[in-house]
Interface confidence: low
Amino acid sequence: EPPTACREKQYLINSQCCSLCQPGQKLVSDCTEFTETECLPCSESEFLDTWNRETRCHQHKYCDPNLGLRVQQKGTSETDTICTCEEGLHCMSESCESCVPHRSCLPGFGVKQIATGVSDTICEPCPVGFFSNVSSAFEKCRPWTSCETKDLVVQQAGTNKTDVVCGPQDRQRALVVIPICLGILFVILLLVLVFIKKVAKKPNDKAPHPKQEPQEINFLDDLPGSNPAAPVQETLHGCQPVTQEDGKESRISVQERQ
């Protein structure tokens, strides 16, 4: 009785089980009662990757350089050619039929995973403490500069797109000293005004004098720093910050601190 099903690697034809052709070979003629299945190897640029009864082999895939493709692995009679993309490009789809340029990570984003021939660049937002100020397919987020390690202070905070701006310590100190100076100046002004009022109110118990011209008061003369002998930090002059000279340490001497 003719079979209704055949074993693995066989096929049913004309009520007969014939052997399938092995990978790399195509069917030339079916088996008969007296002859085996006739198969022929695929030609150079063709392949068949399964046990089959195909009468034609499949053409190897062509990796078209015009589409940015190149051969990653040559095809054999049993396998298809595997294409990949040229440097700087990656496959548009899993079948890799054409290539597109790698994506660049915009400022504020860094490269989490560099692109390959088959996968695009993976970007990630720069977390706090990190930044990226370039559009790049290779650069990761970079850490903010540590001002402390350079004996500097943060003058401008960093963002995900910009690094911190460091500056000398003097500026920080000046920000504290200036209000103090202004306070002292205000107090001195008040004292001077009180003194003037008191002098103006004093009774004239002596002989009349010729009328005196009002004395010009130079408030600056009373300010710290205008008197060379007055102890004052060298970074301040008339309560104005002065740039610290390179190589000089901004410390008050023992004598100055007394």
């Epitope: 051969v71 692995q73 040229e86």
Partner: antibody
């Protein structure tokens, strides 16, 4: 008959420029990639540049990148190589060659007779 | 950059088989072409796609390529086969030639 004829070679001083031409005939010029290959006296073959069939893609050897430019004129069936900032080491016979089909699969199946470029002061 | 290495010279007696080797890293993954260049002439492709012969090239020329080595074989070598032979591949958008092998037919 498929034919490639180069011209434009000659003597040029270092730092100078030259433009080589390659007139193609006997085949559909726009259907094939085209290459320039050079051969210094007594030396082997050195690839210079290739241009795709459509002209959309160009590739260069590192030794000429930024100095040489390959181009093609479909109306004149002509391939060009513009050579700038020439150096003594660019002295060679320059061949133009037709790619035998799809780039690396078929090799360069037709070559011109070559044109000599001499860079010397 | 990719490199192809060839022996500078190979000698063979007429009628014998000449084998010219071209080696390069994972060369078997690439398609190799072979060119013949006789003195004063332009190169001619004798093998493409590893082992295919263009029309007009005698059957005595054959090619193979696997692993790190490609081989051009000339069986029944004739005096007219005396020439320089170059292997060539495409690698990452560039064409790479081997240094060339001078085939000398003795006698």
């Amino acid at each position: 008959e498929v034919q490639l004829v180069e011209s434009g070679g000659g003597l040029v001083q270092p730092g100078g420029s030259l433009r080589l031409s390659c007139a193609a005939s006997g085949f559909t010029f726009g259907s094939y990639a085209m290459s320039w290959v050079r051969q210094a006296p007594g030396k082997g073959l050195e690839w210079v540049s290739v241009i795709s069939d459509s002209g959309g893609r160009t590739y260069y050897a590192d030794s000429v990148k930024g100095r040489f430019t390959i181009s093609r004129d479909y109306s004149k069936n002509t391939l060009y190589l513009q050579m700038n900032s020439l150096r003594a080491e660019d002295t060679a016979v320059y061949y133009c060659a037709k790619e035998g089909g799809d780039y690396y699969y078929y090799g360069m199946d037709v070559w011109g007779q070559g044109t000599t470029v001499t860079v010397s002061s | 950059s990719y490199e192809l290495t060839q022996p500078p010279s190979v000698s063979v007696s007429p009628g014998q088989t000449a084998s010219i080797i071209c080696s390069g890293d994972k060369l078997g993954d690439k398609y190799v072409c072979w060119y013949q260049q006789k003195p004063g002439q332009s190169p001619v492709v004798v093998i493409y796609h590893d082992n295919k012969r263009p029309s007009g090239i005698p059957e005595r020329f054959s090619g193979s390529n696997s692993g790190n080595t490609a081989t051009l074989t000339i069986s029944g070598t004739q005096a007219m086969d005396e020439a320089d032979y170059y292997c060539q591949v495409w690698d990452s958008s560039t064409v790479v030639f081997g240094g060339g092998t001078k085939l000398t037919v003795l006698g």
